[in-house]
């Protein structure tokens, strides 16, 4: 068998809502993956599990099942949404995210995703993790790759 390549493309959109009383931020983050099947037979994308971390705390999880079948030597782009909640011990972020004097309220989130594919009864898991900027202050649609947080990926000077 040839490889199945999973490429995390980035955040596609982030939709924000607030609970004023609870000082809680709700972020629905839609991500984009490219999955390439380099084989001469079809593979099934059985599930995608994803989680989002802020400051080493898991703030959201999602799981998609029976997603699609990718034909031989084909590629499919898949969007998945992770609902996240920034609350409780992180409610201090409410003040930052709701500052009306700041135009872009970027926070750095770690996106983790695991794709499970199956073919001929064989199962394979591919995982990726990436740091991304997300604006927690307004609804935002991103150009693909626009939200990448490069600083984290650079070696220390």
């Amino acid at each position: 068998p040839r490889s199945i390549d999973v490429k995390y493309i980035g955040v596609k959109s982030a939709y924000v809502s607030y609970d004023v009383q609870k000082r809680t931020i709700y972020l629905n983050i839609t991500n984009t993956l490219n999955i390439t099947n380099n084989n001469y037979y079809s593979v099934e994308v059985e599930n995608i599990t994803a989680q989002v971390q802020f400051s080493k705390t898991v703030i959201g999880k999602a799981r998609l099942n029976n997603i699609t079948i990718i034909g031989p030597l084909d590629m499919k782009q898949i969007d998945y949404t992770v609902p996240t909640v920034i609350a409780e011990e992180m409610s201090y972020m409410y003040d930052f995210c709701t500052l009306i004097s700041i135009k872009v309220h970027n926070i750095v989130l770690m996106m983790q995703v695991t794709v499970t594919t199956t073919y001929f009864g064989h199962s394979e898991q591919i995982s990726q993790e990436r740091y991304q900027y997300v604006d927690c202050g307004r609804n935002t649609t991103y150009q693909l790759g626009q939200s990448e947080y490069l600083n984290v990926l650079q070696p220390q000077q």
Partner: antibody, heavy 119, light 112 residues
Framework: QVQLQQSGAELVKPGASVKISCKGS????????MNWVKQRPGKGLEWIGQ????????NYNGKFKGKATLTADKSSTTAYIHLSSLTSEDSAVYFC????????????WGQGTSVTVSS | DVVMTQTPLSLPVSLGDQASISCRSS???????????LHWYVQKPGQSPKLLIY???NRFSGVPDRFSGSGSGTDFTLKISRVEAEDLGVYFC?????????FGGGTKLESK
């Protein structure tokens, strides 16, 4: 420390236009909204509008649309207000004021520029 | 536009007295994010306004604790517990919850 230095007083004729500058220093100029406020002699304060130097985005008080145009030059960290078709009603002191991030108020002000419209 | 009404117009005080300025808005100043954007500024003759109190009750850096702000919704008050000579000037309330931002007409704090 934050400083907003405005250009000097202007005496202009009715119907003419004028451009006032406000040079910001001591902070990240591109990342803060710059506001403009009008004060007529012995009168209160009127908010004209604001500009975000990072991308040139503007918000205006409807009363000043067509009268005032706000621009900013990131390279020289200077904000400008252009006032057109001047009348005696435009004679006033014009202030620039930075919108602070955490107090969410106009926490630093220029010294003001006096504009006198007279024939 | 939101109308900000300040009273009194003029406030003669003796040094050491308490002073109280009222500011009323024509509609609620509570933003959808739960914060209330009511600020107070003071302007001395020939100077630009200076921020005194932000978001109802927070003293700006360097502002003495004899200044305090209170209120909610549409009714707000600025108090100076013991007026000093350097406090004399014109006090403005301002709202930035609604566009356009608007100011009160000003209260002149003067010596009796």
């Amino acid at each position: 420390q934050v400083q907003l230095q405005q250009s000097g007083a202007e005496l202009v004729k009715p119907g003419a236009s004028v451009k006032i500058s406000c040079k910001g220093s001591g902070y990240a100029f591109s990342s803060y909204w710059m506001n403009w406020v009008k004060q007529r002699p012995g009168k209160g304060l009127e908010w004209i509008g604001q500009i975000y130097p990072g991308d040139g985005d503007t918000n205006y008080n409807g009363k000043f649309k067509g009268k005032a145009t706000l621009t900013a030059d990131k390279s020289s960290t200077t904000a400008y207000i252009h006032l057109s078709s001047l009348t005696s009603e435009d004679s006033a002191v014009y202030f620039c004021a930075r919108w602070g991030h955490y107090d969410e108020a106009m926490d630093d002000w220029g010294q003001g520029t006096s504009v006198t419209v007279s024939s | 536009d939101v109308v900000m009404t300040q009273t009194p117009l003029s406030l003669p005080v003796s040094l050491g007295d308490q002073a109280s300025i009222s500011c009323r808005s024509s509609q609620s100043l509570v933003h959808s994010n739960g914060k209330t954007y009511l600020h107070w500024y003071v302007q001395k003759p020939g100077q630009s306004p200076k921020l005194l109190i932000y978001k109802i009750s927070n003293r700006f850096s360097g502002v003495p604790d004899r200044f305090s702000g209170s209120g909610s919704g549409t009714d707000f008050t600025l108090k100076i517990s013991r007026v000093e000579a350097e406090d004399l000037g014109v006090y403005f309330c301002s709202q930035i919850t609604h566009v356009p931002w608007t100011f009160g007409g000003g209260t002149k704090l003067e010596s009796k």
